[in-house]
């Protein structure tokens, strides 16, 4: 048997089952592309020299078996062995020291078996009617979710409780409440309705302080940027015991503390100042940038130490947002302006490195042009997102650029830099015979492909050399074949293709000849 | 290994209905794939139905489907066959078996290391 495919025989290891109850569980199976599986489990117990087989039987009732050797994860294709649209039964057997260990099984179909996300980011918790409410967002593209959580305190064990069915973009959870005692609470979820679904990991603790409180200790959580291009930083005030869970542990406890908040905004380095301190009773507003915040805490000793969080950027992009236009003497961008007399800050990174490495420039104050738009132009002797790559780019606006809390996020996008309809080029342009009457083009994807939102479409040109007719095709930017019908035999052809942005119309490949053979009958 | 008891055989006429019951004893019975199994006189023993340990999927011989239910309580140890529209043809010895591993097919008998001793059942036109 292939090691990429499912193996419909025997296994290669005699039935010598354990019983132990050690060995293969947690067993979790989904799709993880268009076509492609994966499987991963845990071992308990000693590893060496364990060899895991995956188990499966068809609703056929035939039953095969994937070798993993020592790994615990495993992925194979659509194509084997295993059918995907109907219903499997998968189970691990682990073979080691002469027996067998058989991990719980799971039942499903696995094309529709999704990686279900447990919840992600901010958990809100709140009171409600002398229960715990959670809220969180639902994971995207996780709608329909069956949700379970987890509790303990600093002297129970792990309790298990049913959330129930969710189907909405928030989910919510209505858990107990302790009077005197913290407790750390764990969600997960899996798909809803899925017979055997998987369950997801379980999230990050979510530590609760008790109904009672003691003395406040700081946290914050980030919301969502606004249309405005602004998010509020938040400050949750979190209560905290001497004894917390085990998951819950190193928050120090506080005293009677004054707090000052220190905001470091890390993007767009060209800017006049960079950090803003302020009372922490007055929360500010945020650009999409990333920054560093500080809490300084001060008691009537004197000061503490400084808690420090770092805010990710909002790596949302928008990429109809920005236009491009390049001419002879330069490039020019235009986006929708945001006021009369705003300083904008344009940062640019190439894909793929470093946050360190961006580069950015901040326009005079300037107002919208007759079309409501602002624009940042440059040359090309400037050397600004002139190599040909893929280069994410964000700007903010501010109409008080010396005011930290007062710069928003316009836009975030990607632009392919230098001369893109030359360098998006496709090459490796290749025709096959398809029928009597067609063929199949085939070219390497564009270096535009790279770069998200960039590459609008690729476009086939076929000219008949005799007649000289020419007809386009235009293609998906995610396709790379094109299928040509209608043609005749004996003719010559030539066949190039080129790859179109949104701005730009690309270069076409060299042309490739080809010709259909006359089929002669006997 | 684990032992299998089956109960529940008996004489029916055409058309009725009988419930088989096996119940195991011995090694965890949560870690058997459950199989049922017939021999009619001067034939082969053919599969009847099967069920997987976690007693999701199931499986049936064409002979049976949408007539037979196989189903399984793991906290009971018991493995159980629901026939309904009994035919004469279903006349046979009913053998409950167990696989604590199973091969190329849920169907083929060399799967199963455990027998009961069985259970006659005899439908009468």
């Known amino acids: 048997c292939r090691t990429s495919e499912c193996c419909f025989q025997d296994p290669p290891y005699p039935d010598a089952d354990s019983g132990s109850a050690s060995g293969p569980r947690d067993l979790r199976c989904y799709r993880i592309s268009s076509d492609r599986y994966e499987c991963s489990w845990q071992y308990e117990g000693p590893t060496a020299g364990v060899s895991h087989f995956l188990r499966c039987c068809l609703s056929s009732g035939r039953c095969c078996y994937f070798a993993a050797g020592s790994a615990t994860r495993l992925q194979f294709s659509d194509q084997a062995g295993v059918s995907v649209l109907y219903t499997v039964t998968l189970w691990v057997e682990s073979w080691a020291r002469n027996q067998t260990e058989k991990s719980p099984e799971v039942t499903l179909q696995l094309y529709n078996s999704v990686k279900y996300e447990p919840p992600l980011g901010d958990i809100k918790v709140s009171k409600l009617a002398g229960q715990l409410r959670m809220e969180w967002e639902t994971p995207d593209n996780q709608v329909g979710a069956e949700v379970q959580f987890r509790h303990r305190t600093p002297s129970s064990p792990w309790k298990l409780g049913d959330c129930g069915p969710q189907d909405d973009d928030t989910e919510s959870c209505l858990c107990p409440l302790e009077m005197n005692v913290a407790q750390e609470f764990q969600l997960r979820r899996r798909q809803l309705g899925s017979q055997g679904s998987s369950w997801s990991k379980w999230s990050s603790p979510v530590c609760v302080p008790p109904e009672n409180p003691p003395q406040p200790q700081v946290r914050f959580s980030v919301e969502q940027l606004g249309q405005d291009g602004r998010r509020r930083l938040t400050l949750k005030e979190q209560p905290t015991q001497l004894e917390l869970p085990e998951g819950c542990q190193g928050l120090a406890p506080g005293t009677e503390v004054t707090y000052r908040l220190q905001l470091h905004m890390l993007s767009c380095p060209c800017k006049a100042k960079a950090t803003r301190t302020l009372h922490l009773g007055k929360m500010p507003y945020l650009s999409g940038a990333a920054y560093n915040v500080a809490v300084i805490s001060s008691n009537q000793f004197g000061p503490g130490l400084n808690q420090t969080w770092h805010i990710p950027a909002d790596t949302h992009t928008e990429p109809v947002a920005l236009n491009i236009s390049v001419g002879t003497n330069g490039t020019t961008m235009y986006w929708p302006a945001r006021a009369q007399s705003m300083t904008y800050c344009i940062e640019w990174q190439p894909v793929g490195q470093d946050g360190g490495l961006a580069t950015c420039s901040l326009t005079a104050p300037q107002d919208p042009d007759p079309a409501g738009m602002a624009t940042y132009s440059w040359s090309r002797e400037s050397g600004a997102m002139g190599q040909e790559k893929c280069y994410y780019i964000t700007i903010f606006a501010s109409a008080h650029p010396e005011k930290l809390t007062l710069w928003s996020t316009v836009l975030s996008t990607y632009h392919f830099g230098g001369n893109a309809s030359a360098a998006g080029t496709p090459h490796h342009v290749s025709v096959k015979n398809h029928s009597l009457d067609s063929v199949s083009v085939d070219w390497a994807p564009s270096l535009l492909s790279t770069c998200p939102g960039v590459l609008k479409e690729y476009v086939v040109r076929c000219r008949d050399e005799d007649s000289k007719q020419v007809s386009e095709h235009p293609v998906q930017p995610t396709e790379t074949q094109v299928t040509l019908s209608g043609l005749r035999a004996g003719v010559a052809y030539t066949v190039q293709v080129r790859a179109d942005t949104a701005w730009l119309r690309g270069v076409w490949s060299q042309p490739q000849r080809f010709s259909i053979e006359v089929q002669v009958s006997d | 290994q684990v032992q299998l008891v089956e109960s529940g055989g008996g004489l029916v006429q055409a058309g009725g209905s009988l419930r088989l019951s096996c119940a195991a004893s011995g090694r965890t019975f949560s870690s058997y794939v459950m199989g049922w199994f017939r021999q009619a006189p001067g034939q082969e023993r053919e599969f009847v139905a099967a069920i997987m340990r976690n007693g999701i999927m199931t499986y049936y011989a064409d002979s049976v489907k949408g007539r037979f239910t196989i189903s399984r309580d793991n906290a009971k140890n018991t493995v159980y066959l629901q026939m309904n529209t009994l035919k004469p043809d279903d006349t046979a010895v009913y053998y409950c078996?167990?696989?604590?591993?199973?091969?190329?097919?849920?169907?083929?008998?060399?799967?199963?290391?455990?027998w009961g001793q069985g259970t006659q059942v005899t439908v009468s036109s």
């Open positions: 078996a167990a696989a604590s591993r199973v091969g190329v097919s849920i169907s083929q008998s060399s799967s199963y290391t455990s």
